[in-house]
């Protein structure tokens, strides 16, 4: 039930996340499932546990197997399993199916290819990108943060894309590659009146004075690429930028996700060092598109 497949190539770094949810303060114990032997946390080991992460620096074929993680939360211990397979490097260019991450689809308007699993690693830009083993060159290709953007996508752009980056651990560098297929589709979408998934209308969010708090505004707008769609936060009916409180900021850029095929956007409002006066404000999550505007209001209440 709580098992996750992970794979990598020998002599590359592989980092695996425990498939159970955790919190920063909860310890996570890792074990070799077959032997029940504990995995060390000391970084001098080639394979070591680091909280929710299990690190193979670098990986070897013999590391393949099932690993157990136990999140030591109060009340219940949450147990998960990581099924790890390390493969020998291929001599030819073909990437076998078992090394492929999920296929992504793009269109003329939306052609982002995310580098799989990169968020688990300590890497620095730029990423290197390859298509069918050839390094991508030309102004149509732009490596931006953790994804590749292709301008003026054509059907010939379909294929297998590999991202390559360097993971740094305590001054040592390890190579990582990840490959996924990209398909090009005709965009046949539709738009709906915005549906706000979070927060609930008139939700009361409990916060602690002096701590940081995050509010997420999440809404869906239809299927496919949306011509106009936005989510944003307002404070007492005023745009965040106009409100003039530097402690309260919206997350730069909107995080796009596809839920059940729907185009959805998230915007996180970050409140640093929550103060008493923040409890008096009205926080409005706004979602708008060509059909209109929907608003959900949140208020903050104090946690003792």
């Amino acid at each position: 039930k709580f098992s996750k497949q992970s794979w990598g190539l020998e002599n590359e770094a592989l980092i695996v996340r425990c498939p159970r949810q955790g919190k920063p303060s909860y310890t996570v114990d890792w074990y070799y499932s077959q032997t029940n032997k504990s995995i060390p946390t000391q970084e001098r080991n080639r394979v070591f546990a680091s909280g929710q992460l299990l690190k193979f620096l670098p990986a070897e074929v013999a590391d393949s197997g099932i690993y157990t993680c136990i999140v030591r939360s109060p009340t219940f211990n949450r147990t998960g399993y990581a099924n790890v397979t390390i493969y020998k490097k291929q001599s030819d260019c073909n990437v076998p199916d078992y090394l492929m991450y999920s296929t992504v689809s793009g269109s003329e308007k939306n052609s982002k290819i995310y580098c799989p699993t990169i968020d688990l690693y300590n890497w620095t830009a730029p990423l290197e990108w390859f298509k069918n083993c050839q390094a991508l060159q030309g102004s149509r290709y732009r490596a931006h943060k953790s994804f590749l953007v292709i301008d003026n996508v054509m059907t010939e752009d379909a294929g297998d894309y590999t991202c390559k980056f360097i993971h740094n651990e305590n001054g040592a560098n390890y190579s990582v590659t990840a490959t996924r297929s990209f398909t090009v589709k005709d965009e046949q979408g539709f738009s709906l009146f915005p549906v706000i998934g979070a927060p609930a209308q008139n939700e009361i969010k409990e916060v602690e004075i002096g701590k940081n708090a995050n509010l997420t505004c999440s809404a869906c707008f239809g299927k496919g690429t949306q011509f106009l769609a936005a989510v944003l936060w307002q404070l007492n009916g005023t745009k965040i930028t106009d409100f003039g409180e530097p402690r309260i900021q919206q997350e730069e850029g909107q995080n796009q996700s596809f839920s059940n095929g729907l185009a959805c956007l998230d915007m996180v409002l970050r409140i640093a060092d929550v103060k008493e006066e923040d409890l008096l404000l009205q926080y409005d999550c706004l979602a708008l598109n060509l059909h209109g505007l929907r608003r959900h209001t949140v208020r903050l209440s104090r946690k003792n």
Epitope: F2, P24, T27, P74, F76, R78, P199, E203, E208
Partner: antibody
Framework: EVQLVESGGGLVQPGGSLRLSCAAS????????MHWVRQATGKGLEWVSS???????YYSGSVKGRFTISRENARNSLYLQMNSLRAGDTAVYYC?????????????????WGQGTTVTVSS | NIVMTQTPLSLSVTPGQPASISCKSS???????????LFWYLQKPGQPPQLLIY???NRFSGVPDRFSGSGSGTDFTLKISRVEAEDVGVYYC????????FGPGTKVEIK
């Protein structure tokens, strides 16, 4: 307003079944572990069952194999399917909210309780 | 299973006077995250339990400051500095280090 409302209680014969429901409102249901606690008349509180945010389930020894807890996040609802009921299961059943997994800072125990629904097992 | 015991099981208090309830656990309630998972609840007649104290000594939102919690490891105490008529009911301690266990309850009444 944060609220939990239980329903589905009633009179049932030994060996019979009941399904309790709990409707949650005023908070992001999907980020909380949820629990059932019962209380026989004039007695103390007894934990019955729990379901975490990822759907893992937990049961007290006295109900294991007979009761099934489940949740439907899209409907903000918690359920307790009770089979093979015994006289000893007669109690007020409370739905209660547990740990918030969207909050890294603190765990408030069982901080919100419903009013309870009464289950009577008798022939 | 962690067993919780409470003393006394009943308590009759004069309004304005202090009251104290003891709770003991069969093993330490200190978690590896450094927090102690001990809670106090009050159940007023005909009502569901309501949270008073979390994490041994933290008053929950809206709880009057005449209620205070203390203790560590396996020994805990709930104190009411000046008992009021509205404080009558049954007080339960609860652990959530391993599943949930409640103490047997302490019935507080007014003299």
């Amino acid at each position: 307003e944060v609220q939990l409302v239980e329903s589905g209680g009633g009179l049932v014969q030994p060996g019979g079944s009941l399904r309790l429901s709990c409707a949650a409102s005023g908070f992001t249901f999907s980020t909380f572990d949820m629990h059932w606690v019962r209380q026989a008349t004039g007695k103390g509180l007894e934990w019955v069952s729990s379901i975490d945010t990822e759907g893992d389930t937990y049961y007290s020894g006295s109900v294991k194999g007979r009761f099934t807890i489940s949740r439907e996040n899209a409907r903000n609802s918690l359920y307790l399917q009770m089979n093979s009921l015994r006289a000893g299961d007669t109690a007020v059943y409370y739905c209660t909210r547990g740990e918030d997994w969207s909050d890294d800072d603190y765990y408030y125990g069982l901080d919100v309780w419903g009013q309870g629904t009464t289950v009577t097992v008798s022939s | 299973n962690i067993v919780m015991t409470q003393t006394p099981l009943s308590l009759s208090v004069t309004p304005g006077q202090p009251a104290s309830i003891s709770c003991k656990s069969s093993q330490s309630l200190l978690h590896s995250d450094g927090k102690t998972y001990l809670f106090w609840y009050l159940q007023k007649p005909g009502q569901p339990p309501q949270l008073l104290i979390y994490g041994v000594s933290n008053r929950f939102s809206g709880v009057p400051d005449r209620f205070s919690g203390s203790g560590s490891g396996t020994d805990f105490t709930l104190k009411i500095s000046r008992v009021e008529a509205e404080d009558v009911g049954v007080y339960y301690c609860m652990q959530s280090l391993q599943l949930f266990t409640f103490g047997p309850g302490t019935k507080v009444e007014i003299k």
